[in-house]
C-alpha cells in the first residue's frame, strides 16, 4: 500500500460481498496535530493517508481535553455535559458513586447517556464491532456492540489490527459495517516524557507501523479503496513543569473541607459527600480564589460563568467551582502533589497543544484535500452519513462537514421561521405617555415631534437601511410564540421582543472609517419613549432609577451616529437593555474603541447584538417560565449574557454589504455579571483588559443561535452547508504551541 501512488477512484471499489463501504473509526490517543507536521517523515503510512485522503489542519477536542469525555463525544456527537462523561474522574450525587478509570464502576450504564455510534448502527440493522473504545463494554441502554473486546491495554497493536482484519473476513451476514480501533499511544509516551521527547517519537513510529499493517491488510483484501477510514485523536498533549504549580494551600488557611480534582482542569466540591454537596459554598470559594496574585496562573469560575463555547456547566457531575488553568500549569491541593513534569492534557480546548488530528480516506471522502479545523462533535453525524443512517439527536450541526465528502448524503436546509414578525408602525408623532423618560434637549412638542418623525421611514429608506444594515437578512426567530416587530432606522434595524420589553437583536454596519478615533460621547441624560412601540410593551425609564446596580445600556450605540441630531434615533426606549454598571463600562469601551478597530481592519463589519437568557445554563434559550422565575420586583428580565456577532467579508477588498464570497465571523457571548472580577481590572485602564475579556468569550455563531433562538445568514446567497461551516467556525487567536 505504502509504495503505490494515491488511487483516485471515482466511486467505491469494493469486492464482491461488500455492497456498501465499511467504516473504521481509528483513534490514536493524545496524537496532537502538531506531531503530524513535525514528525511527518517518521510516519510514512499516516503521512500517505494525509497526502492521499482528506485531513484537517486540526480537530478541536471538547473541554476538558481528556480521554473518556472526548472519545465518548466522538461516538455520540454530544458535549460531555450532555453525555455524562464529564471527566475521567467524577462524582454523581444522585448515584452517590465515584467514576474512575481504575474502578469497575465505569461499566455502570447509569454514567453513560446518549446513543453511541455502535448502537445507532445496530438500531438501524447494521452490525458494529469495537476493538476498545470508552463505553464499548458497557450495556448502554441495555445493549453492547455486536462484537466487542474487554479492555486490555497490554494487547499488542499488531494483534488488534489482525483481529479487526479477521472481522472484515467474516461472512457477509455476520460482518460488521462499523468498526472502532483504539491505541493508547502516543498518549502514554506523551505523559511519560512530554510531547517533545524521544519516547513520543518512538511511539509515533510504532503506531505508524501498526497503521501501515492495517492499510496493507486492507490492500490484500482489495478493501483499501472500499473502506472509509477515519484516523483521529481525542486531544493533544502539553509539557508540564514542577515549578509551574498553583497550590490551594497558598489561597486557603485550611483545605480539608473541600475535595479537589487536581491538574489541568481542576474542579472543587465539598469533601463530605453527599451530605454537604448542595450546601457547599461554591461562591465563597471562587471569591477566595479571584484576583489574589498579580501573576495568578488560573482563573476561578462558577461553571455557569465559564465561556459558553465550552458547554461545560449543565450536569450535576460538573462541580460548581472550576479553575481555568494557564497552559503548562497545574493546580493542585498542596505541595504533597508531586505529579508534575512530563506531559498532560485537559486544558482549554483552544490551546494549540490540545489540538487533535483528523484524517480520512476512502471512496466517500474527497482526495488530496486539507480542510479548515472543526470540532469533534461533528464526527458522529459524518459517520452516520458514511453509513447512510439516521443520527440520534446530538450537538453537532448536520451538514457542516459536507465539504469532506465527494457526494454529500444529507442536504441541510435553513430552519423555518417559527414566530412571524410584524412591523411596529409609526402612527403617533407624539408619545401618548412619557414612560418617565426625559430629554432636556428637546424643549417643546415641536422639537419632539421633529425627532420622532425621523423614525418614520419611507419605503425607499427602509429598503436602503435593510441593504446596508441587514446585508445577510434579518435573524429569523425560531422560538415559539414570540411576539416581535421590526423597527427600522437609518443607521440600524432592530427586532423588538414585546415579551421582554427590549430588542431581541439589533443589526448595523460599521464602515471602515478613515477616522479611527474613539466615538464621541453619547448625548447625555436624554431618553424618550419610542412612539412606535405600545407603552404597555415598553420599558419605563424609571425602571433604571431605583438602586438596583442596574443601569440602561444601548444595544445600538447612539454615538455611532456621529452627529447629535442623528443620535436621537437611538436614544429611545426600544434601544434600551438592562446592564450592570460595571458591565456597561466594558460594553461601552468595546463599542467606542474595539469595534472601530475591527471595522478598520476588516473593511467594515456588520454587527448583530442582543440579550441572552440562559438562567438554567444549558446553552439553550430559556422558556418564558424559566426567565420569570428570576424576576425580582420587575417585569423587565435581566439578561444572563449579551451576544455580539461581527461579520465581514473574507475578501477584505469588499465591504460586508457587497460581499460576493465567503464571510468572516467573530462572535462573542459575554456573561452579564455585576462585577468585572473575571478580569481583575482594579487600577487597570480598559485598554488592558476589555479586549482580553471579549476574546476569552469568543464562541461560534451556532452557540449564539442556540442561546437566542435566532437563525442568521438566511439571505446570504451561498449553499446552506457552507453557511453551516461558517456557523460552526470558532475563531482562535492562539499562536504558540
Amino acid at each position: 500500500w505504502l509504495e503505490e501512488n494515491c488511487d483516485t477512484a471515482q466511486q467505491s471499489q469494493c469486492p464482491e460481498g461488500f455492497d456498501l463501504p465499511p467504516v473504521i473509526l481509528f483513534s490514536m490517543d493524545g496524537f496532537r496535530a502538531e506531531y503530524l507536521y513535525t514528525w511527518d517523515t517518521l510516519m510514512p503510512n499516516i503521512n500517505k493517508l494525509k497526502t492521499c485522503g482528506i485531513h484537517s489542519k486540526y480537530m478541536r477536542a471538547m473541554y476538558p481535553t481528556k480521554t473518556f469525555p472526548n472519545h465518548y463525544t466522538i461516538v455520540t456527537g454530544l458535549y460531555p455535559e450532555s453525555h455524562g462523561i464529564i471527566d475521567n474522574n467524577m462524582y454523581d450525587v444522585n448515584l452517590n458513586k465515584n467514576f474512575s478509570l481504575s474502578s469497575k464502576e465505569q461499566n455502570n450504564p447509569a454514567w453513560w447517556h446518549g446513543q453511541p455510534m455502535w448502537l445507532t448502527a445496530m438500531y438501524q440493522g447494521l452490525k458494529a464491532a469495537t476493538y476498545f473504545w470508552p463505553g464499548s463494554e458497557v450495556a448502554i441502554n441495555g445493549s453492547f456492540p455486536s462484537i466487542y473486546m474487554p479492555y486490555n491495554g497490554s494487547v499488542p497493536f499488531e494483534e488488534r489490527i489482525s483481529t479487526l482484519l479477521k472481522w472484515l473476513d467474516l461472512p457477509k451476514a455476520e460482518r460488521p459495517r462499523f468498526y472502532t480501533m483504539y491505541f493508547e499511544e502516543p498518549d502514554s509516551s506523551g505523559h511519560a516524557g512530554g510531547p517533545v521527547s524521544a519516547r513520543v517519537i518512538k511511539a509515533l513510529q510504532v503506531v505508524d507501523h501498526a497503521f501501515g499493517m492495517l492499510m496493507e491488510g486492507l490492500k490484500q483484501r482489495n478493501l483499501h479503496n472500499c473502506v472509509n477510514i477515519i484516523l483521529l485523536a481525542d486531544h493533544g498533549m502539553d509539557q508540564t513543569y514542577c515549578n509551574k504549580m498553583e497550590y490551594m494551600t497558598d489561597y486557603f488557611p485550611r483545605i480539608n473541607f473541600f475535595y479537589m480534582y487536581e491538574g489541568p482542569a481542576p474542579r472543587i466540591r465539598a469533601h463530605n459527600i453527599p451530605h454537604d454537596f448542595f450546601s457547599f459554598n461554591s461562591e465563597e470559594i471562587v471569591r477566595n480564589l479571584s484576583c489574589r496574585k498579580p501573576d495568578q496562573h488560573f482563573k476561578p469560575y462558577l461553571t455557569p460563568d465559564l465561556p459558553k463555547r465550552l458547554h461545560y456547566a449543565k450536569n450535576v457531575r460538573i462541580d460548581k467551582v472550576h479553575l481555568f488553568v494557564d497552559q503548562q500549569w497545574l493546580a493542585v491541593r498542596s505541595k504533597s502533589n508531586t505529579n508534575c513534569g512530563g506531559g498532560n492534557h485537559g486544558y482549554n480546548n483552544e490551546f494549540r497543544s490540545m489540538e487533535a488530528i483528523f484524517l480520512a480516506h476512502g471512496p466517500s471522502f474527497k482526495e488530496k484535500t486539507e480542510v479548515e479545523p472543526f470540532e469533534n462533535i461533528e464526527v458522529y453525524n459524518l459517520m452516520c452519513d458514511l453509513l447512510r443512517i439516521q443520527p440520534a439527536p446530538n450537538n453537532g450541526t448536520h451538514g457542516s462537514l459536507n465539504h469532506l465528502l465527494k457526494v454529500p448524503f444529507y442536504e441541510p436546509s435553513h430552519a423555518e421561521e417559527v414566530s412571524k414578525f410584524s412591523v411596529c408602525g409609526f402612527a403617533n408623532p407624539l408619545p401618548t405617555e412619557s414612560l418617565d423618560c426625559f430629554c432636556p434637549h428637546l424643549q417643546n412638542s415641536t422639537q419632539l415631534e421633529q425627532v420622532n418623525q425621523m423614525l418614520n421611514l419611507t419605503q425607499e429608506e427602509i429598503t436602503a437601511t435593510v441593504k446596508v444594515n441587514l446585508p445577510f437578512g434579518r435573524p429569523r426567530v425560531l422560538q415559539k410564540n414570540v411576539d416581535h416587530c421590526l423597527l427600522y432606522h437609518r443607521e440600524y434595524v432592530s427586532g423588538f421582543g414585546k415579551a421582554m420589553r427590549m430588542p431581541m437583536w439589533s443589526s448595523y454596519t460599521v464602515p471602515q472609517l478613515g477616522d479611527t478615533s474613539p466615538l464621541p460621547p453619547t448625548v447625555p441624560d436624554c431618553l424618550r419613549a419610542d412612539v412606535r412601540v405600545p407603552p404597555s410593551e415598553s420599558q419605563k425609564c424609571s425602571f433604571y432609577l431605583a438602586d438596583k446596580n442596574i443601569t440602561h445600556g444601548f444595544l445600538y450605540p447612539p454615538a455611532s451616529n456621529r452627529t447629535s441630531d442623528s443620535q436621537y434615533d437611538a436614544l429611545i426606549t426600544s434601544n434600551l437593555v438592562p446592564m450592570y454598571e460595571e458591565f456597561r463600562k466594558m460594553w461601552d469601551y468595546f463599542h467606542s474603541v474595539l469595534l472601530i478597530k475591527h471595522a478598520t481592519e476588516r473593511n467594515g463589519v456588520n454587527v448583530v447584538s442582543g440579550p441572552i437568557f440562559d438562567y438554567n445554563y444549558d446553552g439553550h434559550f430559556d422558556a418564558p417560565d424559566e426567565i420569570t422565575k428570576h424576576l425580582a420586583n420587575t417585569d423587565v428580565p435581566i439578561p444572563t449574557h449579551y451576544f455580539v456577532v461581527l461579520t465581514s467579508c473574507k475578501n477584505k477588498s469588499h465591504t460586508p454589504e457587497n460581499c460576493p464570497g465567503w464571510l468572516d465571523v467573530l462572535p462573542f457571548i459575554i456573561p452579564h455579571r455585576p462585577t468585572n472580577v473575571e478580569s481583575c481590572p482594579e487600577g487597570k485602564p480598559e485598554a488592558l483588559w476589555v479586549e482580553e475579556r471579549f476574546t476569552a468569550h469568543i464562541a461560534r455563531v451556532r452557540d449564539v443561535e442556540l442561546l437566542t433562538g435566532l437563525d442568521f445568514y438566511q439571505d446570504k446567497v451561498q449553499p446552506v452547508s457552507e453557511i453551516l461551516q461558517l456557523k460552526t467556525y470558532l475563531p482562535t487567536f492562539e499562536t504558540t504551541i
Epitope: 408602525g425 402612527a427 403617533n428 401618548t432 405617555e433 414612560l435 410564540n481 411576539d483 415579551a499 405600545p534 407603552p535 404597555s536 419605563k540 418564558p624 417560565d625 420569570t628 422565575k629 424576576l631 425580582a632 420586583n633 420587575t634 417585569d635
Partner: antibody, heavy 120, light 107 residues
Amino acid sequence: QVQLQESGPGLVKPSETLSLTCTVSGGSISSYYWSWIRQPPGKGLEWIGYVYFSGSTNYNPSLKSRVTISVDTSKNQFSLKLSSVTAADTAVYYCARATRDYYYYGMDVWGQGTTVTVSS
Amino acid sequence: DIQMTQSPSSLSASVGDRVTITCRTSHDISNYLNWYQQKPGKAPKLLIYAASSLQSGVPSRFSGSRSGTDFTLTISSLQPEDFATYYCQQTYSTLFTFGPGTKVDIK
C-alpha cells in the same frame, strides 16, 4: 380551572384605608398580571392598576398617590390598599387576571366582585 | 391619555338581529383593544382580545374588527343571552382605560 375570590370589609369609613385581598385558586399566580377594577353604582368600569407576579406594579395615574397593589406568591394572593377613601370610592371592586402574550393584557378571569361602601 | 368613545351608548334590538357596536380611540393603538360583556350583577367577561381574536369558549357569532382608530364589535345574530352591556378596553398605553359602555336591550 383558575378562580378568583375577593375578600375584605364591605364598609369603610371616610379617610380610612380600604383593604381587599384576592385569592387565586386552581392555578399559579406566576407569569400573569393581576388587576383591580372597580365599578361605581350605575357607572362604567375603571381600571385601578395591576401587579405582576414578580412584584412590579402599574397604577392608574388618577389614583396613584393613594393606591398600593402587592402580591404574595406563597399564599397565591394579591391585595389592594386604597388610602384616604371618600364616598366617591364606593363601588363594586373586581380582581382579574390579565394575560399578556397575544392576549394584549386581555382580562380573561374575573372574581365575582365585592361591594365596598364608604360611609361613616 | 387615550380617550375612548363608544357608540351608540345604548341600543334596542330583537333576537336574530345583526348588532354592531363601535369604539373609537383618540390615538392609533394598533390592535391593543379588548371587548367585554357584562350582565347585571355579574363580573365582565372577555369576548375579543387583540381587536379581532375570539376568546376561547365565546360563540362564533361574536367578531371584532379594526379600521384605523375605529374598532367594531359585531354580533351576527343576537341571542337572548346577549342582552348586556358591552365595554371596549385599550391596553396600548400603561393606563388601561375602558370605554363608557354600550347597553344592548330588548326592543
